[in-house]
């Protein structure tokens, strides 16, 4: 028998994948354990085998359909379940009844890029992945800018309290290096949490022009 | 829906090998556990070995451990067998099967399968 605390995580894309994480204090590394997904309204189950991302905690993705498909609707209730072998049996490790529209979390934004860039000024725009026509426009963004010499820990937090996939950096030095993140979450879900932040976009603002000599 | 290709089947003789692929189309490859079922003549469709998802794991019956080797290549979307020290006992047809749920894929009922390809080894 395995002893200790338990927790079972797991977050909804809003399409087609649900990820999740299994923490065991205790448990062994070379067991084999499922996540096993049981919908109440549909005809399919699904399951991911759980792989170790540290000393007691698994993670795996429950790949629902192609990337865009939307697999569940807010009305959707999964049954999920740890199941890890024990000899010849499987033995339920956890469970919870998974409400998708609960438990979200997006893909990270893809496809940064620089739309226009001036000596204290940047203009960036992006794209969401993967995320439900369900949302019309009810999403929220956080952004964030690293500059030379800080951590992104330090860099302060801009938010965008409505689907602008754009953002207009201001007050920024002339000819210096930055790199941008942004980050997505639905305004639905008690659970809901802040997608991943995306790849770092690079970018350099313009050198000031040499003023005349007074 | 999805669609499975075996290949690699033929006559061989006792002591050699084989290696059979099947090859998925028509959905994302990684959601499904594949698994490797054979039928002798006259008899009903027996359970070789079985992979799940990631990879990570291969469970086969007791009369291939040792000699049969399941793997898979998610970036090629193919499921392989290879089958080494053939007895005439393999002799079969074999076929690739796929299913969403690990636990249901020994229950031959709701997967999905190739059309087979036979394996006969001489004595």
């Known amino acids: 028998a395995v002893n200790g605390t338990s927790q079972f995580t797991c977050f909804y894309n809003s399409r087609a994948n649900i990820s999740c994480v299994w923490s065991q204090d205790g448990a062994l590394q070379d067991t084999s354990c499922q996540v096993h997904a049981w919908p109440d309204r549909r005809r399919w189950n699904q399951t991911c085998e759980l792989l170790p991302v540290s000393q007691a905690s698994w993670a795996c993705n429950l790949i629902l359909g192609a990337p865009d498909s939307q697999k569940l609707t807010t009305v959707d209730i999964v049954t999920l379940r740890v199941l890890c072998r024990e000899g010849v049996r499987w033995r339920v490790m956890a469970i919870q009844d998974f409400k998708p529209f609960e438990n979200l979390r997006l893909m990270a934004p893809i496809s940064l890029q620089v739309v226009h860039v001036e000596t204290h000024r940047c203009n960036i725009s992006w794209e969401i992945s993967q995320a439900s026509h369900y949302f019309e426009r009810h999403l929220e963004f956080e952004a964030r800018t690293l500059s030379p010499g800080h951590t992104w820990e330090e860099a302060p937090l801009l938010t965008l309290k409505q689907k602008q996939e754009w953002i207009c950096l201001e007050t920024l030095t002339p000819d210096t290096q930055y790199e941008f993140q942004v980050r997505v979450k639905p305004l639905q879900g008690e659970f809901t949490t802040w997608s991943p932040w995306s790849q770092p976009l690079a970018f350099r603002t313009k050198p000031a022009a040499l003023g005349k000599d007074t | 829906e999805v669609q499975l290709v075996e290949s690699g089947g033929g006559l061989v003789q006792a002591g050699g090998s084989l290696r059979l692929s099947c090859v998925v189309s028509?959905?994302?490859?990684?959601?499904?556990?594949m698994a490797w079922f054979r039928q002798a003549p006259g008899k009903g469709r027996e359970f070789v070995a079985v992979v799940t998802d990631s990879g990570r794991t291969t469970e086969y019956v007791d009369s291939v451990k040792g000699r049969f080797t399941v793997s898979r290549d998610n970036a090629k979307n193919t499921v392989y067998l290879q089958m080494n020290n053939l007895k005439p006992e393999d002799t079969a047809v074999y076929y690739c099967?796929?299913?969403?749920?690990?636990?249901?894929?020994?229950?031959?009922?709701?997967?999905?399968w190739g059309q087979g390809t036979q394996v006969t080894v001489s004595s």
């Open positions: 028509g959905d994302v490859f990684v959601r499904y556990t």
């Open positions: 099967a796929a299913n969403t749920d690990y636990f249901q894929i020994r229950s031959v009922d709701n997967n999905a």
